[in-house]
């Protein structure tokens, strides 16, 4: 089966490398604007200029296209914790990311929030905290892992998974009941 | 079949608390980011909040940020959402989604908070 292809790349594969057919003269290839720029009008014929402009300010186009348009640069989510790593520029879109001692949670694949890397306090650090990991901790005796924080035993209700881990210090909160009881 | 089935809401004073509760089945609760919508009357949908499968992590919207709370049981496949300090403005229909990839995938029928004296 011969994979489908879009109408865009039918006449672009018509065309050598960084040239695109002109949508009205499918005999005439017209260069590919460079980055930074967008189509402003198409070539008048063979070998001759494709009307290229400069992305405004708040614009940009990443990579040699035809579009009619730039494209609109990202907003860094606030809300989301993100701060600007590095400002849209006519050829490259700003750039978002999380602060020092953060990591990203991705809600999608192109939304993310930012969280605070565990600290791993009552145990020790087993991985360190990454650009899209959080810090993997090992708990101390006595504690047990919760949402990645490391809780007292003395908070593990017999219902919760943390019995197994917990389970001499359950059993000794238990003997001591017994032993007042005698 | 996905049901979603929330229950808490009421007519409350400004200042009040509610506690809404989502009960969840049909559906793996502990692999889904769960989330809480609403609309107020005559408004478009807003995120409230929504929060991760396994609970860690949680987002607020910024007109609720400091007064509410969400969490999730998976052991009982209920989602819950703590409301306090509540303001004529919270009033609206809250619905409880399951988060797929930010689009919600199933919505329960609502329950309606009304903040009023």
């Known amino acids: 089966l011969v994979p489908h292809l879009g109408d865009r790349e039918k006449r672009d594969s018509v065309c050598p490398q960084g040239k695109y057919i002109h949508p009205q003269n499918n005999s005439i290839c017209c260069t590919k604007c460079h980055k930074g720029t967008y189509l402003y009008n198409d070539c008048p014929g063979p070998g001759q200029d494709t009307d290229c402009r400069e992305c405004e300010s708040g614009s940009f186009t990443a990579s040699e296209n035809h579009l009619r348009h730039c494209l609109s640069c990202s907003k860094c989510r606030k809300e989301m914790g993100q701060v600007e790593i590095s400002s849209c520029t006519v050829d490259r879109d700003t750039v978002c990311g999380c602060r020092k001692n953060q990591y990203r949670h991705y809600w999608s694949e192109n939304l993310f929030q930012c969280f605070n890397c565990s600290l791993c306090l009552n145990g020790t650090v087993h991985l360190s905290c990454q650009e899209k990991q959080n810090t993997v901790c090992t708990c101390h005796a006595g504690f047990f892992l919760r949402e990645n924080e490391c809780v007292s035993c003395s908070n593990c209700k017999k219902s919760l998974e943390c019995t197994k881990l917990c389970l001499p210090q359950i059993e000794n909160v238990k003997g001591t009941e017994d032993s007042g009881t005698t | 079949e996905v049901q979603l089935l929330e229950s808490g809401g009421g007519l409350v004073q400004p200042g009040g608390s509610l506690r809404l509760s989502c009960a969840a089945s049909g559906f793996t609760f502990t692999e889904y980011n769960m989330g809480w919508v609403r609309q107020a009357p005559g408004k478009g949908l807003e995120w409230v909040s929504f929060i991760g499968h396994s609970g860690q992590h949680t987002y607020y919207a910024d007109s609720v940020k400091g007064r509410f709370t969400i969490s999730r049981d998976n052991s009982k496949n209920t989602l819950y959402l703590q409301m306090n300090s509540l303001r004529a403005e919270d009033t609206a229909v809250y619905y409880c989604?399951?988060?797929?990839?930010?689009?919600?995938?199933?919505w329960g029928q609502g329950t309606l908070v009304t903040v009023s004296s």
């Open positions: 989604a399951e988060l797929n990839n930010l689009m919600f995938d199933y």
